[in-house]
């Protein structure tokens, strides 16, 4: 039976790899009954996770789902890092996963590592 | 429902390559992870990778990475295994397995799909 | 990579007779979120596996409840109260907390 709760479907262990200076749409799918609950986005830092105030965010509305999409315009280098998205649904605070972000810096890197590279050697991104 | 229909049986000489392919249906493609998993015959199970086909982002098996490749076209809904310089090893039952919502718990199996390394 | 060990390997059970599979991991499979990521599958002979059970102790829509799965950490129990003939198979239990994701060798069930 379908759930009538709030569901944010972020990826489990998800990574995006992505190039600084590039426009990037980080999508947070949520699945929701009636009302659109109220979605934030945050970086973790450690164990605490920092909610972004004031970064553009947006909706997108789909057949079966819903999307709160984080717009990062364009990335930088320091967007590096894991975000996760939570929402307030009838008093009760719903995380998702966390979904880790691999900036490359197009000025620092001489080539660009492929997408499985990067995935399996993320220290590449530091070199 | 979820139904994962995967490409017929294949025969292969030692050394050549192997392209599997996995059409999804019933479910949003973008929305999960695809997985690879093999069983040799009268033996266990044996994961080799996922790939996220939103972004085409692959995690494998130390084991298998250099020699598979796990790609996705979400204009098909389709996932597909290639695995180059096949050995008498190699000879397997490939299924190709999806999660919901890319949970990563391997909730829904394809029918299978053979492929034997012979010279 | 985390290893899974299965006990015992094979087993033969009279029908309406429990059954208990054993499976321990080499490190704790407690992620950071809280979450165990420990399922089971059986396989029945010519077929697909099946998952059974997820996060430990969930049990999958269509699964009869005389199976159940159990434990924490790194000690993990599958137990089937009354096995029935249509039982039959190989069932593995499977960590998702660690890349590469592992299975344990299996566990092929009989019936007497």
């Known amino acids: 039976k379908e759930s009538c709760d709030v569901q944010l479907y972020i990826k489990r262990q998800s990574e995006h790899s992505i190039l600084a200076g590039d426009p990037f749409e980080l999508e947070c799918p949520v699945k929701y009954c009636a009302n659109r609950p109220h979605v934030t986005w945050c970086k973790l830092n450690g164990t605490t996770c920092v909610k972004l105030e004031d970064r553009q965010t947006s909706w997108k509305e789909e057949k079966n789902i819903s999307f709160f999409i984080l717009h990062f315009e364009p990335v930088l280098p320091n967007d590096n890092g894991s975000y996760r998205c939570s929402a307030n649904f009838q008093s009760n605070l719903i995380e998702s996963h966390s979904t880790t972000l691999y900036v490359t810096d197009v000025k620092s890197a001489s080539e660009r590592p492929s997408k499985d590279e990067m995935a399996s050697r993320p220290w590449l991104l530091y070199r | 429902q979820v139904q994962l229909v995967q490409s017929g049986a294949e025969v292969k000489k030692p050394g050549a390559s192997v392209k599997l392919s996995c059409k999804a249906s019933g479910y949003n493609f973008k929305h999960t992870y695809a997985h690879w998993v093999r069983q040799a015959p009268g033996q266990g199970l044996e994961w080799i990778g996922r790939?996220?086909?939103?972004?085409?982002?692959?995690k494998y098996d130390p084991k298998f990475q250099g020699r598979a490749t796990m790609t996705a076209d979400t204009a098909s809904n389709t996932a597909y295994l290639e695995l180059s310089s096949l050995r008498s090893e190699d000879t397997a039952v490939y299924y190709c397995?999806?999660?919901?919502?890319?949970?990563?718990?391997?909730?829904?199996w394809g029918q299978g799909t053979l492929v034997t390394v012979s010279s | 990579d985390v290893v899974m060990t299965q006990t015992p390997l094979s087993l033969s059970v009279t029908p309406g007779q429990p059954a208990s599979i054993s499976c321990k991991s080499s490190q704790s499979l407690l992620d950071s979120d809280g979450k165990t990521y420990l399922n089971w599958f059986q396989q029945r002979p010519g077929q697909s596996p099946r998952r059974l059970i997820y996060?430990?102790?969930k049990l999958d829509s269509g699964v009869p409840d005389r199976f159940s799965g159990s434990g924490s950490g790194t000690d993990f129990t599958l137990k089937i109260s009354r096995v029935e003939a249509e039982d039959v198979g190989v069932y593995y239990c499977?960590?998702?907390?660690?890349?590469?994701?592992?299975f344990g060798q299996g566990t092929k069930l009989e019936i007497k």
């Open positions: 397995v999806a999660d919901h919502y890319g949970s990563s718990l391997l909730d829904y």
């Open positions: 499977w960590q998702g907390t660690y890349f590469p994701y592992t």
């Open positions: 790939i996220d086909p939103a972004n085409g982002n692959t």
């Open positions: 996060l430990v102790s």
